[in-house]
Amino acid sequence: MSSKYPRSVRRCLPLWALTLEAALILLFYFFTHYDASLEDQKGLVASYQVGQDLTVMAAIGLGFLTSSFRRHSWSSVAFNLFMLALGVQWAILLDGFLSQFPSGKVVITLFSIRLATMSALSVLISVDAVLGKVNLAQLVVMVLVEVTALGNLRMVISNIFNTDYHMNMMHIYVFAAYFGLSVAWCLPKPLPEGTEDKDQTATIPSLSAMLGALFLWMFWPSFNSALLRSPIERKNAVFNTYYAVAVSVVTAISGSSLAHPQGKISKTYVHSAVLAGGVAVGTSCHLIPSPWLAMVLGLVAGLISVGGAKYLPGCCNRVLGIPHSSIMGYNFSLLGLLGEIIYIVLLVLDTVGAGNGMIGFQVLLSIGELSLAIVIALMSGLLTGLLLNLKIWKAPHEAKYFDDQVFWKFPHLAVGF
């Protein structure tokens, strides 16, 4: 017999989500208006295309990338969409309140939506570590806390360290990874006997996860270049990201084969390692002066990703209860750190090249920025984890982890689904 959504959650989720949606509508009604200045159509279309790329990355790319579980593929895709839709709404309001509110009303532009989509992407990266172990009501909490934490982090970094939009947002990799890992650490870990098969991957869902990886691979240059100010910066960012992800694909596939005793290629390694280069060059994608450097970074990132996928899952599964196929969290944490270190190296070179005695101070500022991102991620992640453990959310029982049947109505239940 199909397992039903627990009665209490059936009552609590619609009420909680719809009340929240009504509150958001009211906030939009009272505090926002559209940008009234007349922007020409060509400019609008170009600006919208960037936002569209980001939405495709979020909805299709990350949605399908997390859908490789044998019995949790529907939930992965749909819950991702739900979180994206909710996250974008809250991020638009929050960014507006934090940056424009003293002037009276929040002006919504296409750029606001672009920023909000990127903020919501953070949640989609983090949630990979907990998908299958939480219900939608809990995910709503996670969206609200993470988007709020990231928005505040960006504002603090912008005000204290005076960084631009791009540098500010590129902490997203490290932030999202550590947030997700700390939430996972708080959730019940052991899978009871008889449910181990559910967190295994299956061929068709793995194919859809590969489709997600392909979409992310195609649009990663748009993500890395979306917030840059000048055409030359965007051009360099697109080129360098493309070279880096191209090399990380080759590295991922060959490295995966190398890591296997029989030379076989692991789907899980490939899913995440193809993106490695894009994450590693993110912070400095517009600054890398020549293609070969971006390619070397892609190679190093691919190797780190495959190495991480081979040796870290055991530790992550034991300590954090993260299934073997959910490797985005620790992958992004390592690669995000690599990206930040590369930027610090560039900063040192810049300061040294200027014959400037203030290297230590500059490096200290950058490390401070990175540390702040990690600390806020860990603290807000732990807070979220503690909130998600509250009884009111009626979290799925451990026996119902990674199970679409808990959440979805299937017209017929085929054996073995």
Partner: antibody
């Protein structure tokens, strides 16, 4: 030849409005960020506003935030500055300038490489 | 905040002139210099602390890093009598200009 030509200046009463235009020739506005910079009589240069090359971001000096709006029409290759609630402090020569970027090592260096001749705005009763 | 010294100076044709610009915090080499003649628009001279803009005579040079920068005119010409502004581009916006240094004929 790359050129910028401002127009629309004049005398306006306090609390009044004015729209300045800056026509660009020799390059496309859609591929360049643009600034407005002003200079009060006998004073130095003060940055007023910036619009990104794709029109996605507009930044303003604190002194004009909420009163001035920078915009552009790429089909006319023209930049605008809509000024509202003007006061005597806004009396100045207003210049438009092109935003240019060159890669440094740890960030880009931005500068204003092409300037218009300026248009004078006088706020007086 | 950007400060310039001196606020004005008098010099003769052929003199070597040095103008100093100080930033309130480390801006590495992200500094530009502009020249403005009376009644005219500003003109870019140097960007990135030391790179000469095309079309600018080689007698102009820029140096410095961190918080202290200098603009040097090796041999002052009659057309160089003007006001010179420095502008930081490390933390933008806002785009902060120095108060200017007026170079007058002695």
């Amino acid at each position: 030849q790359v050129k910028l030509l401002e127009s629309g200046g004049g005398v306006v009463q306090p609390g009044g409005s004015l729209r300045l235009s800056c026509e660009a020739s020799g390059f496309a506005l859609r591929s360049s960020g643009m600034h407005w910079v002003r200079q009060a009589p006998g004073k130095g240069l003060e940055w007023v506003a910036l619009i990104w090359f794709d029109g996605s971001i507009r930044s303003y000096a604190e002194s004009v935030k909420g009163r001035f709006t920078i915009s552009r029409d790429t089909s006319k290759n023209t930049l605008y500055l809509q000024m509202r609630s003007l006061s005597a402090d806004d009396t100045a020569v207003y210049y438009c300038a092109r935003d240019k970027a060159v890669r440094g090592i740890s960030r880009y260096n931005y500068y204003m490489d092409v300037w218009g001749k300026g248009t004078t705005v006088t706020v007086s009763s | 905040v950007m400060t310039q010294s001196p606020s004005s100076l008098s010099a003769s044709v052929g003199d070597r002139v040095t103008i100093t610009c100080r930033a309130s915090q480390n801006i590495i080499r992200y500094l530009n210099w502009y020249q403005q003649k009376p009644g005219k628009a500003p003109r870019l001279l140097i960007y990135g602390a030391s790179t000469l803009q095309s079309g600018v005579p080689s007698r102009f040079s820029g140096s410095g890093s961190g918080t202290d920068f200098t603009l040097t005119i090796s041999s002052l010409q009659p057309e160089d009598f003007a006001t010179y502004y420095c502008q930081q581009s490390y933390r933008t916006p806002p785009f902060t200009f120095g108060p200017g240094t007026k170079v007058e004929i002695k």
